[in-house]
Interface confidence: low
């Protein structure tokens, strides 16, 4: 009956991180079983930058320093599972940790933007302020993101200008609007890696006014933009 | 062989923009890993991280100066370039470029000298 | 910000010493600290990574310790031409920053 080394459920394992993930974060976990039953001790080698330590017990893999991406990715370290006790045999996987830039949220609208309104007839070009924002975290920058108009189509009677990072202005290009709703299609791009895009809609209101407001049927509340 | 060269004006005055050019030979930044940082040591004084750039144009400024710097790259030409707005004569120095990889700036330009001036 | 302060602004040894400079950080930097060497003429070269690996081409009389705050570099048999300014540089977290230099003169 030959003493057999602990195997490993996989060759390599693979986990994804982001650069910014916090010290002391788990980013992975290895297993191996022992033929003969024994228990396991597992422990990395080939750490060259010092990045990781391994619950000698539970494979569970953290960090231990910042994650530096420009260092290039993945990083590669050997984990080694050795029995305790009995011939103290050992075996080794690869453990892949892939640095990322995590950014899955597109960009959406701040608020709520409906009721925009303009007093009909536009006495001059007219433009409101809106804002973006996303669900991802921005530790070592702020959201950059750039603002165009939806489609070509719109570009007859619409421009956007981007003011900083998370808000841009709207401006009509004319004063030539009918006494209606326009539903204005905006694309919203993060510039994240890889880049994501969001298609928000700005429905604004041409309407007669009374004192500064829009007259509209009861129910319906809008709120003022200067123009 | 890897080198780096930084380039300035020398001489400039109060109020104006500092450009400042590093020129390197023997990697390119557009490799996996590469980027390039300016740092600057007034006269008699340490050193001072200023702005990082890295191989695919993402950029690390340091916040106390963030609002006055911009610094840029031209892959093609094996160039980076920095931008600093509003100079004082608090921004006399010495200018370095140097290549970062692996969290390391192991290797440096001679630096270029700026003097502020009125 | 990580403050690095290096308390020894300058130090003189005779040739032949041992010669130990010391840098520590405001706040523990996991062991992520390079040290430069500055030569009167403004040349900067890395030295150490890391806190203890040698960059390659630099001699092996060079050598770095430490851990959590306190870190030193250390020259164990003096050349004349290690006479320079050594810098300490934390990379745990932006901005990057370096500690005030310890300039290294031959008594």
């Known amino acids: 009956d030959v003493n057999e080394a602990p195997q490993f459920s996989q060759h390599v394992f693979q986990a994804k991180v982001s650069e910014d993930v916090a010290i002391g974060t788990k980013v992975g976990n290895v297993t191996a079983k022992d033929p003969e039953g024994l228990d396991i001790s597992y422990s990395l080698r080939g750490d060259t930058r010092g990045w990781l330590k391994i619950d000698h017990v539970t494979g569970e893999i953290f960090s231990v320093a910042p994650l530096d991406r420009e260092a290039g990715s993945p990083y590669r370290v050997q984990v080694v599972a050795t029995e305790v006790g009995g011939s103290s045999l050992s075996s080794v996987s690869e453990f892949h940790l892939i640095l990322m830039d995590v950014n899955d949220n597109p960009p959406r609208l701040a608020k709520d933007y409906t009721g925009l309104f303009f007093c009909h007839p536009l006495s001059a070009p007219g433009s409101l302020i809106f804002e973006a924002t996303d669900d991802d975290q921005h530790l070592f920058r702020g959201p950059h993101f750039t603002f165009s108009l939806g489609s070509g189509s719109l570009q007859n009677d619409w421009e956007v200008s981007k003011i900083n990072g998370t808000h841009a202005r709207l401006s009509t290009r004319h004063t030539e609007f009918e006494e209606r709703e326009y539903v204005v299609l905006i694309r919203i791009n993060d510039g994240g890696r890889p880049p994501l895009e969001g298609i928000v809609s700005l429905p604004v209101t041409f309407c007669s006014c009374v004192e500064g407001s829009c007259f509209r049927p009861a129910g319906h509340k809008h709120h003022h933009h200067h123009h | 062989q890897v080198t780096l060269k930084e380039s300035g004006p020398g001489i400039l005055q109060p109020s104006q923009t500092l450009s400042l050019t590093c020129s390197f030979s023997?990697?390119?930044?557009?490799?996996?890993?590469?980027?390039v940082s300016w740092i600057r040591q007034p006269s008699g004084k340490g050193l001072e991280w200023l702005a990082h750039i890295f191989w695919d144009d993402d950029k690390r400024y340091n916040p106390s100066l963030k609002s006055r710097l911009t610094i840029s790259k031209d892959t093609s030409r094996n160039q980076v370039f920095l931008k600093i707005t509003s100079v004082d004569t608090a921004d006399s120095a010495t200018y370095y470029c140097?290549?970062?990889?692996?969290?390391?700036?192991?290797?440096w330009g001679a630096g270029t000298s700026v003097t502020v001036s009125s | 910000d990580i403050q690095m302060t290096q308390t020894t602004s300058s130090l003189s040894a005779s040739l032949g010493d041992r010669v130990t400079i010391s840098c520590s950080a405001s706040q523990g930097i996991n062991n992520y600290l390079n040290w430069y060497q500055q030569k009167p003429d403004g040349t900067v070269k890395l030295l150490i990574y890391y806190t203890s690996s040698l960059h390659s081409g630099v001699p092996s009389r060079f050598s770095g310790s430490g851990s959590g705050t306190d870190f030193s570099l250390t020259i164990s048999n003096l050349e004349p031409e290690d006479i320079a300014t050594y810098y300490c540089q934390q990379y745990s977290k932006l901005p990057l920053t370096f500690g005030g230099g310890t300039k290294l003169e031959i008594k």
């Open positions: 023997g990697f390119s930044l557009s490799t996996s890993g590469m980027g």
């Open positions: 140097a290549r970062r990889v692996l969290s390391t700036f192991d290797v």
